[in-house]
């Protein structure tokens, strides 16, 4: 079915991966489709097979090279095509001239760890993964802390408007279990979006010292 609403969205992780999602209402789940990437100034082409992620959407990752290799630059344009098999031939279903550094979504931050914890505060650090050296320090972060009895959606967002890979959480409750997440976004790119949230880091504040007013 071609008449259903369809959408094709891709993001570049700034190094060697373009992740794409193709959605089409009314398409058959077993339809065989792929994404083809054709850069304007590179010798390589790349293809990935779209695999179902929900009733009407498919996703795949164009792996352009080693994870930390810089495969594209700000001047590259990559023509992307969705191709679906119809009988013996492939049919083009979507096309886009993709500017990688206008469509960025970095990998989630990794290696979260508690640097220091007290009764009311906790210092946490993390690292960014597979982020281009082109950004230098032009990154921002959002963080959130899950308190007991609340959901992630209710957690207030803490914004770090610079490349700062640590945070000191304050006004915490003693002897309490918390979880913490962080995500990253380059300042560059008209259609750039936030990375996925990091894996949550669980930590517990220290108990208040007995007989002391802390």
């Amino acid at each position: 079915a071609v008449n259903g609403t369809s959408q094709f969205t891709c993001f570049y992780n700034s190094r060697a991966n373009i992740s794409c999602v193709w959605s089409q209402d009314g398409a058959l789940q077993d339809t065989s489709c792929q994404v083809h990437a054709w850069p304007d100034r590179r010798r390589w082409n790349q293809t990935c097979e779209l695999l179902p992620v929900s009733q009407a959407s498919w996703a795949c990752n164009l792996i352009l090279g080693a994870p930390d290799s810089q495969k594209l630059t700000t001047v590259d344009i990559v023509t992307l095509r969705v191709l679906c098999r119809e009988g013996v031939r492939w049919r083009v279903m979507a096309i886009q001239d993709f500017k990688p550094f206008e469509n960025l979504r970095l990998m989630a931050p990794i290696s979260l760890q508690v640097v220091h914890v007290e009764t009311h505060r906790c210092n946490i650090s993390w690292e960014i993964s597979q982020a281009s050296h082109y950004f230098e320090r032009h990154l921002e972060f959002e963080a959130r802390t899950l308190s007991p009895g609340h959901t992630w959606e209710e957690a207030p967002l803490l914004t770090l408007k610079q490349k700062q890979e640590w945070i000191c959480l304050e006004t915490l409750t003693p002897d309490t279990q918390y979880e913490f997440q962080v995500r990253v976004k380059p300042l560059q790119g008209e259609f750039t979006t936030w990375s996925p949230w990091s894996q949550p880091l669980a930590f517990r504040t220290k108990p208040a010292a007995l007989g002391k007013d802390t």
Partner: nanobody, 125 residues
Framework: EVQLVESGGGLVQAGGSLRLSCAAS????????MGWFRQAPGKEREFVAA????????MYAESVEGRFTISRENAKNMVYLQMNSLKPEDTAIYYC??????????????????WGQGTQVAVSS
Amino acid sequence: EVQLVESGGGLVQAGGSLRLSCAASGRTFSTTEMGWFRQAPGKEREFVAAITWTGRGTMYAESVEGRFTISRENAKNMVYLQMNSLKPEDTAIYYCAAARRGRAAVRSEGGYDFWGQGTQVAVSS
């Protein structure tokens, strides 16, 4: 915001040719994927062809592949549809459409945010 005006339609005999033009105004035209759709009397609007903003990528409806060619001239803010070997079943109102900037060109109407008023093409047998 992109404004689109089609021209070049008319009456032609089967086997003949026409070239449709779409004039676009708006600063974002040169980085916008464009498409042509058509609507025959009593039928739904259907996809005809699309082109990426550099012109490197094109796609066509099965019914027009090999007969129609989509092209663009960004310096003039123009998109064209060269229609050869026309058939009576190509009779329709032809619409130019623009996707929102940064969005892919697809085969469904919902992928396009800006539309022209249309130009009539009639193919007689």
